[in-house]
């Protein structure tokens, strides 16, 4: 297979960082990280025709180059630029779904509504989803023992900077009506400190984006409140309006029914509010 060829050609030896080295507060690099990234890249480029010409070896070289031999608290967006370039992807800019604290439902939605895309439906998001990685300064080793935690250690760590960079680019590429799925069960439905609140909101381009439409997902079956009136949603509306982008909001009272109606829109029960 293509993957075996890549590993044969490289003959990489990924040593674990010895246990006596610096211990960070977060979990270490995901087991078999290089193999996982390469396997995901090969799988993705086989499935998505517009990315078929992408060379997964070059993608891995660029990914590796972003954090190997670098201090894991001193990573910059520039470190990821080569990877971002190789992973440049033209998704329909009016079919973008952002999400905050409700990843699973957002992904279930785009699995059904195939013409819409979350960040994790793009090559770069797919490569890194649910993975952790870091290296250490001046050695070519991957640290499988521990990696910096965003709060306890440092914010400029390989994983956080990756998601900040790729999220910014994803938001910058959006146009027309952009949707965002928000978790109505959380105390802060819109959180200014989330990736959506701190990165994506501020990188939507007003000259391209007409409207941000929030979908507030209710948690309880009997919850009939209008969560679009929540103070944090009003805060989001204020931020968006100041950026000359229109804002709209919808309550999704029954997420299970919502997904069912996306699958079968002609179902008679799908005309009522969901």
């Amino acid at each position: 297979s293509g993957l075996n060829d890549i590993f044969e050609a490289q003959k990489i030896e990924w040593h674990e960082v010895p246990r006596w080295r610096q211990q960070w507060s977060g979990p270490g690099t995901t087991k078999r990280f290089p193999e996982t990234v390469l396997a995901r890249c090969v799988k993705y480029t086989e499935i998505h025709p517009e990315m078929r010409h992408v060379d997964c070896q070059s993608v891995w070289d660029a990914f590796k180059g972003a954090f190997i031999s670098k201090h894991p608290c001193n990573i910059t967006e520039e470190d990821y630029q080569p990877l971002m370039k190789l992973g440049t992807q033209t998704v329909p800019c009016n079919k973008i779904l952002l999400w905050s604290r409700i990843k699973d439902l957002a992904h279930q939605f785009t699995q059904v509504q195939r013409d819409m895309f979350t960040l994790e439906d793009t090559l770069l998001g797919y490569l890194a989803d649910d993975l952790t990685w870091c290296g250490e300064f001046n050695t070519s080793k991957i640290n499988y023992q521990s990696c910096p935690d965003w709060r306890k250690d440092c914010s400029n760590n390989p994983v956080s900077v990756f998601w900040k960079t790729v999220s910014r680019r994803f938001a910058e590429a959006a146009c027309d009506v952009v949707h965002v799925m928000l978790n109505g069960s959380r105390s802060k439905i819109f959180d200014k400190n989330s990736t959506f609140g701190s990165v994506e909101v501020h990188n939507l381009q007003p000259e391209k984006v007409q409207t941000l439409e929030a979908w507030v997902i209710h948690g309880g079956r009997e919850d009939s409140r209008d969560l679009c009136q929540d103070p944090t949603i009003k805060e989001l509306e204020s931020i968006i309006s100041k950026r000359n982008i229109q804002f709209s909001c919808k309550n999704i009272y029954r997420p299970d029914k919502f997904l069912q109606c996306v699958k079968n829109p002609e179902d008679s029960s799908c005309t009522s509010e969901i």
Epitope: A62, Q81, K85, T90
Partner: antibody, heavy 121, light 110 residues
């Protein structure tokens, strides 16, 4: 002053090889992608390959160039190379190197070009 | 393969005329606006005029303007000057960091 200077072009037999050079001066080499672009006589522009070397070399190619063309870089000489093998008559063109600033607002276009070197097969 | 189609291929104009060149891409460019325009004179390398569809490159006169998004773009010269007679190319940026150029539009003196 930013300068890109190509060399190494000339007449080569079909099936032959040639190595082009692109010498850079007046800017920090490592902050830029260097892109090879060619132009057949009286025709339009066509991109060939790209390379960036912040730490290790990261390179990629137009589909048609994969396998026959190889891009490389010598940071100590501020020079990028394009090795062209199994050359064909349709590879006859002026070959330009151009720079693209590494940074998301700037990527995707070429703000400085060399004067080009002619390859005749 | 991505095709960028420029029209017209040749355009005759007089000094002071308003000139418009169209560029159509077979696929949407990255970010809906990642398209550049270049000017090339005989025996010279291309020179960047516009980037991201509507941004003027450094040192380019304001008589040049660009517009469009997605797959359709235009370059306009509001009042053609003697120095503007040249060939113009559009260039798109696409998935995987790939590039494509249009076939060119030659603007010649009427």
């Amino acid at each position: 002053e930013v300068q890109l200077l190509e060399s190494g072009g000339g007449l080569v037999q079909p099936g032959g090889s040639l190595r082009l050079s692109c010498a850079a001066s007046g800017f920090s080499f490592n902050n830029y992608w260097i892109i090879w672009i060619r132009q057949a006589p009286g025709k339009g522009l066509e991109w060939v390959a790209a390379i960036y070397s912040p730490s290790g070399d990261i390179k990629y190619y137009a589909d048609w160039a994969k396998g026959r063309f190889t891009v490389s870089k010598d940071n100590s000489k501020n020079t990028v190379y394009l090795q062209m093998n199994s050359l064909r008559a349709e590879d006859t063109a002026v070959y330009y190197c151009a720079r693209e600033l590494a940074g998301s607002s700037y990527e995707g276009y070429f703000e400085s070009w060399g004067q080009g070197t002619l390859v005749t097969v | 393969d991505i095709q960028l189609t420029q029209s017209p291929s040749t355009l005759s104009a007089s000094v002071g005329d308003r000139v418009t060149i169209t560029c159509r891409s077979s696929q949407s460019v990255y970010g809906h606006n990642w398209l550049a325009w270049y000017q090339q004179k005989p025996g010279k390398a291309p020179k960047l005029l516009m980037y991201r569809a509507s941004n003027l490159a450094s040192g380019v006169p304001s008589r040049f303007s660009g517009s469009g998004s997605g797959t359709e773009f235009t370059l306009t010269i509001s009042s053609v000057q003697p120095d503007d007679f040249a060939t113009y190319y559009c260039q798109g940026y696409y998935s995987g960091g790939s590039y494509a150029f249009g076939g060119g539009t030659k603007v010649e003196i009427k």
